[in-house]
Interface confidence: medium
């Protein structure tokens, strides 16, 4: 059933054999195969791709490959009643209409079932009114409008540029400001890099290109109708009025050609400063309404999309572990795309496919990993991380007892400059050690390690000679595993140069122009960056599944806990008088962090010295490492966000994509000076310090000697 190799310290030649088997040419071939037609969640095309992947993973040699289906709430435009935005005159005549679709890229003119740009889960409606330009629609943008400029968005249609924060947060902010509709657009300042041509001649966004995307505020709930539980065949579903996270006002996305027509007529207040100006030849006036001659004209939205309960399919592949089959290392990425998915997600799915093929090759030669590896092709990620969340809800009892780690595998590239890693501190040392063993694909770093090029190009802001590793936020399928279940998680991809490229994401994100040719012509012609990402993701999975002692270093958690405690304390110290008045002290938190540091240090010493040939002691030590991430979970969750249960990290309340440290304390302190009841507000700060201090102390004690 197993070879001897599985029980020994990871033999270098096995890791080498696994890495050597990964081929750029295969990734290229798989990417091409996955991107020829759209694979929108809930469609027949995506079901067929699921079955194809199931069949191929079986051929590659996995022990079992199953489809896991769920019936979840999805959203689609009405095929006979298209969504659009108009400028109307005083008689109600439409004098300008936004485009109904993106001009298809060369070679794709005859492809059917390209979903037109829409904001998924927008309610239906035809609001009309004056326009207000709200910059990025961030919390601070609405503060500027409402508090400084005294501009009231109530009853207005707001227009916001994409970028900086998750679009769902923009819509939530607009709703809270009283807006009756939201128009989202891509400004060239954010989606057109200087000196680069627009697609098909380069990787920039053309004027007719539009970013699709969901506008939910799920806060980790998964399917809006079955929060906390799987959307299976006997599920009890909420009514649509009680559904989680749905927007209450119509929302629609447009490109910058159409945005120009709306913004060029804007009157009212001038932009407050240069940070509110994009790159269009318009004044970026805030409004409300149009200027002088056009003041009687209004904007009208026509939104007719429908929400429908639809079947989705995850593909779950298993490679059984030889020694610890009840310990799971998971590699997962999504399969559904908005259109062709050239980058998102298929650049990731192609890498997963090649990783599965390589593991399968080793298995056919008689090798097995020490621990079980699960491979997942998630569905409906674009509609709110639905496939991964429903599967995790269905399997939560197994996962919380057996889950060692989750490695995410969405887009492999968002640029071709250097590596980007976001992960739990437990994985820092694993990532450092692995990247030191891999070759850099970067020009000018021939013969150098990936670690070296990464550190040079993306240095840590705190630790000299080390690369930057960022916090996990959300907006991808690791969310349920990390934020809800407390399973150590990480993600890696190749990214752009953040110093010189200030645009948000990559310009063609979620547009029809995200094609195979975009990747093959402009981002990674040799697929060498894809191969490197495959080596990083695959190498992490290999080590996590095969090393005798789990490759987690708890001392790195101690370091960041101190950093995060310092940071949150410094934020609180903006209010020294209130700290004194309400007797707010961080002593308990700093004490808990100190205890964690000491206990982690002692645990690490014991880890070096224990008898690794004793399977009971080995399992005990590994379980302490595996369950450390779990120990940061508060079963009650964060205030008003029950599915975000990690006390150290949560998605920012102001930007789902970003991670926030000590989020309970951070949110309690946020804008505290504006709270109507300061005593209550500072009481909540104190409660959150107590929760954080207790959790850190409790986590520390899981690392103490067991008896």
């Amino acid at each position: 059933k197993s070879s001897n190799e599985a029980t020994n310290i990871t033999p270098k030649h096995n890791m080498k054999a696994f890495l050597d088997e990964l081929k750029a040419e295969n990734i290229k071939k798989f990417l091409y195969n996955f991107t020829q037609i759209p694979h929108l969640a809930g469609t027949e095309q995506n079901f067929q791709l699921a079955k194809q992947i199931q069949s191929q993973w079986k051929e590659f040699g996995l022990d079992s490959v199953e489809l896991a289906h769920y019936d979840v709430l999805l959203s689609y435009p009405n095929k006979t009643h298209p969504n659009y935005i108009s400028i109307i005159n005083e008689d109600g005549n439409e004098i300008f209409n936004t485009s109904l679709f993106e001009p298809p890229p060369p070679g794709y003119e005859n492809v059917s079932d390209i979903v037109p740009p829409f904001s998924a889960f927008s309610p239906q409606g035809m609001p009309e009114g004056d326009l207000v330009y709200v910059n990025y629609a961030r919390t601070e943008d609405f503060f500027k409008l409402e508090r400084d400029m005294k501009i009231n968005c109530s009853g207005k249609i707001v227009i916001a540029r994409y970028g900086k924060v998750f679009r769902g947060n923009k819509v939530k902010n607009a709703q809270l400001a009283g807006a009756k509709g939201v128009i989202l657009y891509s400004d060239p300042a954010d989606y057109f890099a200087p000196g680069v041509k627009s697609y098909p001649d380069g990787w920039n966004l053309p004027g007719g290109g539009v970013q699709r995307g969901n506008i939910l505020n799920l806060n980790g709930a998964g399917d809006p109708l079955t929060p906390g539980y799987p959307a299976n065949e006997y599920a009890y579903r909420r009514g649509i009025a009680e559904a989680v996270g749905l927007p209450s006002i119509p929302v629609h996305p447009i490109g910058y050609y159409d945005a120009q027509k709306l913004l060029e007529k804007m009157g009212g207040s001038a932009p407050p400063d240069s940070s509110w100006r994009g790159s269009l030849k318009v004044p970026y006036n805030v409004g409300p309404g149009f200027t002088g001659n056009f003041s009687t004209q209004k904007v009208k939205m026509h939104i007719h999309s429908t929400n429908e309960v639809t079947r989705i399919y995850n593909v779950i592949g298993t490679l059984r572990g030889a020694v610890e089959p009840d310990r799971y290392v998971i590699l997962g990425g999504h399969r559904d795309s908005w259109v062709f998915g050239g980058i998102d997600p298929q650049s990731g799915a192609a890498v997963v496919h090649e990783i599965v093929r390589s593991f399968g090759t080793l298995k056919k030669e008689g090798w097995r990993p020490r621990r079980t590896i699960l491979f997942a092709s998630w569905d409906a990620e674009e509609f709110g991380l639905l496939g991964s969340t429903e599967w995790a809800e269905e399997n939560s009892r197994l996962l919380q007892e057996r889950g060692v780690a989750y490695i995410n595998a969405d887009s492999s590239i968002e640029g071709n400059y250097t590596l980007r890693v976001d992960c739990t501190p437990l994985m820092y040392s694993l990532v450092h050690n692995l990247t030191k063993e891999l070759k850099s694909p970067d020009e000018g770093f021939e013969g150098k390690s990936l670690y070296e090029s990464w550190t040079k190009k993306s240095p840590s802001p705190e630790f000299s000679g080390m690369p930057r590793i960022s916090k996990l936020g959300s907006g991808n399928d690791f969310e349920v595993f990390f934020q809800r279940l407390g399973i150590a998680s990480g993600r890696a991809r190749y990214t752009k140069n953040w110093e010189t490229n200030k645009f948000s994401g990559y310009p063609l994100y979620h547009s029809v122009y995200e094609t195979y040719e975009l990747v093959e012509k402009f981002y990674d012609p040799m697929f060498k960056y894809h191969l490197t990402v495959a080596q990083v993701r695959g190498g992490m999975v290999f080590e996590l599944a095969n090393s005798i002692v789990l490759p987690f270093d708890c001392r790195d958690y101690a370091v960041v806990l101190r950093k995060y405690a310092d940071k949150i304390y410094s934020i609180s110290m903006k209010h020294p008088q209130e700290m004194k008045t309400y007797s707010v002290s961080f002593d308990s938190l700093f004490s808990a962090v100190k205890n964690f540091t000491e206990i982690a240090s002692k645990f690490s010493e014991r880890l070096q010295d224990f008898d690794k040939s004793n399977p009971i002691v080995l399992r005990m030590m590994n379980d302490q490492l595996m369950f450390l991430e779990r120990a940061f979970i508060d079963p009650l969750g964060l205030p008003d966000r029950p599915f975000y249960r990690h006390v150290i990290y949560a998605p920012s309340s102001h930007n789902k994509y970003a991670g926030e440290s000590f989020p309970g304390i951070y949110d309690a302190l946020f804008d505290i000076e504006s709270k109507v009841d300061p005593s209550k507000a500072w009481g909540e700060v104190k409660r959150q310090i107590y929760v954080a201090a207790f959790t850190v102390q409790a986590a520390a004690e899981t690392l103490s000697e067991v008896a």
């Epitope: 900086k164 802001p461 960022s470 990214t495 110290m573």
Partner: nanobody
């Protein structure tokens, strides 16, 4: 858009104190989401982190430089400063000020200023 600009003498004598100021424009240094760093790059070498400061004075220094470094902030002028005492030729480098946070998009760096330590 936030911009950072370093200023200070380009030549410092050995054993003296190197003083640099970073002026932040287009955004407030008081934003609690960020910390403000000094970094240096020796000729032909990688970047070396010197230290960072929150606007309220909470500071972290690189342990290897801690005894010689003072970083301070002046929120009224939207500036933060670096003082490095007892300099030697080994402190010759391009000095950068930077804004940082925990997200990739937060990182911004000034143009840098070359400081030569020589008599």
């Amino acid at each position: 858009q936030v911009q950072l600009q370093e200023s200070g003498p380009g030549l410092v004598k050995p054993s003296q104190t190197l003083s640099l100021t970073c002026t932040v424009s287009g955004g407030s240094i008081s934003n609690s989401g960020y910390y403000w760093s000094w970094i240096r790059q020796h000729p032909g070498k990688g970047l070396e982190w010197i230290g960072f400061i929150y606007y309220n004075g909470s500071i972290h220094y690189n342990p290897s430089l801690k005894s010689r470094v003072i970083i301070s902030v002046d929120t009224s002028k939207n500036q933060f400063s670096l003082k490095l005492s007892s300099v030697t030729a080994a402190d010759t480098a391009v000095y950068y000020c930077a804004r940082d946070g925990d997200d990739y998009g937060d990182y911004l760096r000034g143009q840098g200023t070359l400081v030569t330590v020589s008599s």
